[in-house]
């Protein structure tokens, strides 16, 4: 059943004498493996014998008989899938039909493949896109219906016989669908490639020529133009004539329209290849070109720069920058239309010629107020001298000059006075708009540039003012020299350096921070009583009774100032100690008796020690000694000792009498 055999392979294969042919082939015999395979050349079915006649190029049978031809022809397939064949070398007389006679256990099949072998290598075929335009990338394809593993070939591209430098991509196909070798070349043609011959050359592995295909490039492009001008340098004077001619060197397709442009703008009614300009004016200076169009688009010539020469026009001055700040740099630029450009300039300041200034620009590195005024210039070229224009005004701005602070009051000034000051200046540009004062204070400015200080402070030493426009200029400070009573009067202990103990030599100093005028007097006072008139108050041997509140006074011609009261503290060991008894010095046994150690001490007593009549210390450290319950045996004389950081003091003896209770008396 022939429907059981399915084959896939190229319908026709192409080769040339001496090359080889590789036949990719697959099959499927559904009833079992292949048992016999014969490759016929031009097989014909013999009805008498029910067999195929023809040249047997290859035979593979169960007995393994192989004809000598088998070395040239190779069956590269297998028993169930692959039927690939190779003929190497292939000969002209191999052209025709190849018949693959396949036999399995129960089935037979004849598959036919066409083989076309030419005498010489056949040419490849160049494929071009339908239209090629300049500068647009195209792909050129060279296709050859041949590929064989045993016969390597190469395809090379040439332009006008010279190898093309662009890299080509070569691909081969040896599949059951197709057999070919292809080369693709990406190429951006220029207008100059139009009409040029492109060749695809087939070569063997050694680069030997085998065949080729050629095509002529048809590159569509805009018109390519050349412009010619008379006179050739395109430099004329006003009133001269100029002729420009436009020539088309190439156009594909043919051109359709012509026009002329000046500075990129089309000139009306100029549609011929010649442009005649008669009695030119300076306005006709500019860049000229011709434009010719075809179906691809417009083409433009190179530009011709027509220069119409004329004498300088009236000049103007540009200032960088006005207004200018004093000390900054300024540049003046003389602007005058002229062709050729001016070669010489004359500069004027307030109508007076500026000597040695002949350049287009004048640079002043450091502007001063006197540089202000009107600047003008005159330009000159080979055709003549221009006129002086209106000029430009330079405004030089600067801070107020020679600022001074002036005290309006009669001198001297006393603390608490009202002081009036004015701020004066010599000149200013722009005008002074405000004033500043240092130091800042809650002061009144009754009018611009006048300061009124009510109740002037002792420490208002100096005042400075500034006159301000865009900048502030400060005057030198003026000294108010305010006179005031002594300040910060205080009592300071000079000796001893540490705390004052009873019996020490003590010196107190009356200090003050400042006084104006400097001549002063001192007064010492304790509890409203005058003690001395020196800056120091001395005690040869201080006693606790000297403790108290001390003040000192310092006065000058303006007034007097008192210190804060200063407490003189005298430290002394406990004194005037005595033992008091509660509820009294006679207590009934069994009750509670409290002995208190009273003393006078500075600092207060920190530690008490109690003693009995035998001077034995009792285990108490507090001011009170509590005996509870008190016993008759506790009767006797007690004394206490007080201790502070200065020393110790002891009380005289105090006698406690403890008498029997009625219960005790009753028991006896």
């Amino acid at each position: 059943d022939s429907s059981k055999w399915v084959f896939e392979h190229p319908e026709t294969l192409y080769a040339w004498e001496g090359a080889c042919v590789w036949i990719p082939c697959t099959y499927r015999a559904l009833d079992g493996d292949l048992e016999s395979f014969i490759l016929f050349h031009n097989p014909e079915y013999n009805k008498n014998t029910s067999k195929f006649d023809g040249t047997r190029l290859y035979e593979s049978t169960k007995d393994g008989k192989v004809p000598s031809e088998q070395k040239r022809v190779q069956f590269l397939g297998d028993k169930n899938k692959n039927c690939t064949l190779s003929i190497h070398p292939v000969h002209l007389n191999d052209s025709g039909q190849l018949g693959l006679r396949m036999e399995s256990k129960t089935e037979k099949w004849m598959e036919r493949i066409h083989l076309n072998v030419s005498e010489r290598p056949f040419p490849p075929h160049i494929q071009l896109p339908p239209e090629i335009q300049e500068s647009q990338e195209v792909t050129l394809t060279c296709l050859l219906n041949f590929s064989c593993y045993g016969y390597p070939i190469q395809l090379q591209w040439l332009l006008e016989g010279v190898p093309m430098r662009q890299a080509a991509v070569t691909s081969t196909s040896l599949t059951i669908k197709s057999v070919f070798t292809r080369s693709e070349l990406k190429f951006s043609p220029q207008w100059s490639h139009h009409g040029k011959i492109v060749t695809c050359q087939l070569q063997d592995a050694d680069g030997k020529f085998l065949s080729n295909d050629t095509v002529q490039l048809n590159v569509k492009h805009t018109p390519k133009l050349e412009i010619k001008v008379t006179p050739s340098d395109a430099i004329v004077r006003e009133g001269d004539s100029v002729t420009m001619t436009c020539e088309v060197s190439s156009s594909n397709p043919e051109y359709t329209t012509v026009s002329w442009l000046k500075d990129g703008t089309s000139l009306k009614k100029q549609n011929t290849f010649t442009l005649n300009l008669r009695e030119v004016t300076k306005d006709q200076s500019g860049k000229y070109c011709c434009q010719v169009s075809n179906d691809v688009g417009p083409g433009r010539s190179e530009e011709v720069f027509l220069q119409v020469q004329y004498a300088p026009e009236p000049s103007t001055v540009q200032i960088l920058h006005s207004p200018a700040v004093e000390g900054s740099q300024v540049e003046f630029l003389c602007m005058s239309l002229a062709n050729p450009l001016p070669t010489n300039y004359t500069w004027y300041h307030n109508g007076k010629e500026m000597q040695g200034r002949t350049e287009e620009k004048v640079h002043i590195p450091k502007i001063l107020p006197w540089h202000a005024g009107t600047y003008s210039c005159v330009a000159e070229n080979i055709l003549g001298t221009g006129q002086r224009g209106p000029g430009a005004e330079l405004d030089v701005q600067y801070p107020p000059k020679k600022v001074t602070t002036v005290i309006q009051n009669p001198m001297p000034i006393r603390e608490g006075d009202t002081v009036t000051l004015s701020c004066n200046y010599n000149s200013s540009n722009p005008s002074v708009t405000r004033y500043e004062w240092k130091p800042h204070g809650a002061w009144e400015e009754p009018s611009l540039g006048v300061l009124k200080i009510q109740n002037v402070g002792w420490d208002n030493t100096t005042i400075a003012c500034a006159a301000c426009n865009s900048w502030c200029s400060w005057a030198s400070p003026v000294a108010l020299n305010v006179q005031y009573a002594p300040r910060d009067v205080r009592v300071r202990k000079i000796k001893p350096l540490s705390e004052i103990h009873s019996g020490n030599s003590v010196s107190l100093q009356c200090d003050f921070s400042s006084s104006h005028p400097k001549e002063v007097q001192f007064f010492w006072e304790k509890n409203g009583r005058l003690l001395g008139k020196e800056s120091q108050l001395n005690f040869d041997s201080i006693s606790p009774e000297d403790a108290g509140s001390y003040s000192c006074w310092v006065n000058n011609s303006i007034g007097q100032t008192a210190s804060k009261a200063w407490t003189l503290e005298v430290l002394y060991a406990p004194r005037r100690l005595r033992v008091s008894m509660s509820p009294g010095d006679q207590v009934m046994e069994g009750k509670s008796a409290t002995l208190t150690c009273e003393s006078d001490a500075n600092p207060p007593v920190s530690h008490y020690t109690w003693f009995d009549w035998n001077n034995q210390s009792l285990p108490y450290h507090s001011q009170k000694l509590r005996l509870e319950p008190v016993k008759v045996q506790h009767s006797g004389a007690y004394w206490c000792q007080g201790t502070n950081s200065v020393g110790k003091g002891r009380s005289p003896l105090s006698t406690l009498t403890v008498y029997y209770s009625p219960e005790t008396i009753g028991r006896r």
């Epitope: 009995d612 450290h621 509590r626 005996l627």
Partner: antibody, heavy 127, light 112 residues
Framework: EVQLQQSGPGLVKPSQTLSLTCAIS??????????WNWIRQSPSRGLEWLGR?????????DYASSVRGRVSINVDTSKNQYSLQLNAVTPEDTGVYYC?????????????????WGQGTMVTVSS | QSALTQPASVSGSPGQSITISCTGT?????????VSWYQQHPGKAPKLMIY???NRPSGVSNRFSGSKSGNTASLTISGLQAEDEADYYC????????????FGTGTKVTVL
Amino acid sequence: EVQLQQSGPGLVKPSQTLSLTCAISGDSVLSNSDTWNWIRQSPSRGLEWLGRTYHRSTWYDDYASSVRGRVSINVDTSKNQYSLQLNAVTPEDTGVYYCARDRLQDGNSWSDAFDVWGQGTMVTVSS
Amino acid sequence: QSALTQPASVSGSPGQSITISCTGTSSDVGGYNYVSWYQQHPGKAPKLMIYDVSNRPSGVSNRFSGSKSGNTASLTISGLQAEDEADYYCSSYTSSSTLVYVFGTGTKVTVL
């Protein structure tokens, strides 16, 4: 080496009197630089000073106000010991009772600390 | 007279230092330099560690030190050791009419 040895019952009935004795060895109860103290410890009240006795020219004693009126400390000089008597006890008086010496002179200067302690007596007040 | 105030517990790792505070009033800690510190292991009598604020009795390690500022006394144990785990109490002489001596609430020291 100074040692304090405590003795006395561990169980006392409520309202009865608690009596504990502290025997001194290595020091004298008549020392005029020591005081002899009773201190108790319970979970609820922590360490609590109860009172002291000491001899100078005569005997003195001090008591904490919390027990004043039902406490007395007595001395037996012949046995070199001192004792604590706490009347009308309640379960609140349950705790460990310690005797302790306070040596009040360290050379020539005053000092004050409990430097020697008895071993402690656990007293339970319960019927 | 209320007891002197101590933290209930303080803990530290071996080798570390810890400090226990003891706060009173000007009638006791603040008024006198008679603050003492006691160590008590479970089931044992208290042992004197510091007396008169900062003095150490003979036989007590110099790792124990005391100080006082205002109404607060402090005990510092440096180079903490396992055997230092115990309860610690402070005590002070007081001028209160109800007592002669007052003790602290106690601090449990744990060695981690």
